[in-house]
């Protein structure tokens, strides 16, 4: 199977690495622009320079290219709790992340929200909080895990899955109730 190539990839593959085929004259290979710059004018002929210009503030190109425009810098989503790790430069997009003791939950491939790492109160840390994963907690006896928090077995209703984990406690409660009747 031959991988499908787009028109631009097909044209670029004719030229050596670091060059691209002139859009109006396929016998000319022009040098690509360095990262941090964009294509202002194609090279006029073989061995002649491509006219590349530096990206303006608020835009960037992160790799060698023959783009007619620089890419707009990303903005960190404050409403998602994101903070700026490093600001945009002409050759690198903004890097967004979360604060200390927070992790990322990805709603989609590129959109994440910051959440506080669980502290495992009434339990112990089984796996530490990671950049993209919350702490994994193990609960102490008399507690069960609900939404990654250790909750007292006194909050366990018989219909819930916690009954297995809290079975001794439930039996004890039942036993003390029964012992009170004569």
């Amino acid at each position: 199977l031959v991988p499908h190539l787009g028109d631009r990839e097909k044209r670029d593959s004719v030229c050596p690495q670091g060059k691209y085929i002139h859009p109006q004259n396929n016998s000319i290979c022009c040098t690509k622009c360095h990262k941090g710059t964009y294509l202002y004018n194609d090279c006029p002929g073989p061995g002649q320079d491509t006219d590349c210009r530096e990206c303006e503030s608020g835009s960037f190109t992160a790799s060698e290219n023959h783009l007619r425009h620089c890419l707009s810098c990303s903005k960190c989503r404050k409403e998602m709790g994101q903070v700026e790790i490093s600001s945009c430069t002409v050759d690198r997009d903004t890097v967004c992340g979360c604060r200390k003791n927070q992790y990322r939950h990805y709603w989609s491939e590129n959109l994440f929200q910051c959440f506080n790492c669980s502290l495992c109160l009434n339990g112990t840390v089984h796996l530490s909080c990671q950049e993209k994963q919350n702490t994994v907690c193990t609960c102490h006896a008399g507690f069960f895990l609900r939404e990654n928090e250790c909750v007292s077995c006194s909050n366990c209703k018989k219909s819930l899955e916690c009954t297995k984990l809290c079975l001794p406690q439930i039996e004890n409660v039942k036993g003390t109730e029964d012992s009170g009747t004569t």
Epitope: W107, S108, E109, L111, Q113, E147
Partner: nanobody, 122 residues
Framework: EVQLLESGGGLVQPGGSLRLSCAAS????????MGWVRQAPGKGLEWVSW????????YYADSVKGRFTISRDNSKNTLYLQMNSLRAEDTAVYYC???????????????WGQGTLVTVSS
């Protein structure tokens, strides 16, 4: 066929509470993020809140943070919105939405219900 049926709307005084429900059918509820969108009279659609499949991860618009709580019961295929400390500006038609994420931006809702009207007035 995907169906989303909202209920629980009505007239409530400022400071009051309401609980909206949304019964979902026609698709695997446990595979999708669900959300609430609202439309105030004469205004555009506004995201209120959404909730991940796990029921833990939630998003709230700044305008409702601390007052509204979204939840879901995957065993009942039902989405909820508990609305407390209601204000006049919360008056709107509230729509339940099944979310279909794009790779780069906020979610798009590919299905939504007929809506339930919430009126906050004294």
């Amino acid at each position: 066929e995907v169906q989303l049926l909202e209920s629980g709307g009505g007239l409530v005084q400022p400071g009051g509470s309401l609980r909206l429900s949304c019964a979902a059918s026609g698709y695997t509820f446990t595979e999708y993020t669900m959300g609430w969108v609202r439309q105030a009279p004469g205004k555009g659609l506004e995201w209120v809140s959404w909730i991940a499949v796990d029921g833990i991860h939630t998003y709230y618009a700044d305008s409702v943070k601390g007052r509204f709580t979204i939840s879901r019961d995957n065993s009942k295929n039902t989405l909820y919105l508990q609305m407390n400390s209601l204000r006049a500006e919360d008056t709107a038609v509230y729509y339940c939405a099944k979310l279909d994420w794009t790779a780069t931006d906020f979610s798009i809702f590919d299905y939504w219900g007929q809506g339930t009207l919430v009126t906050v007035s004294s």
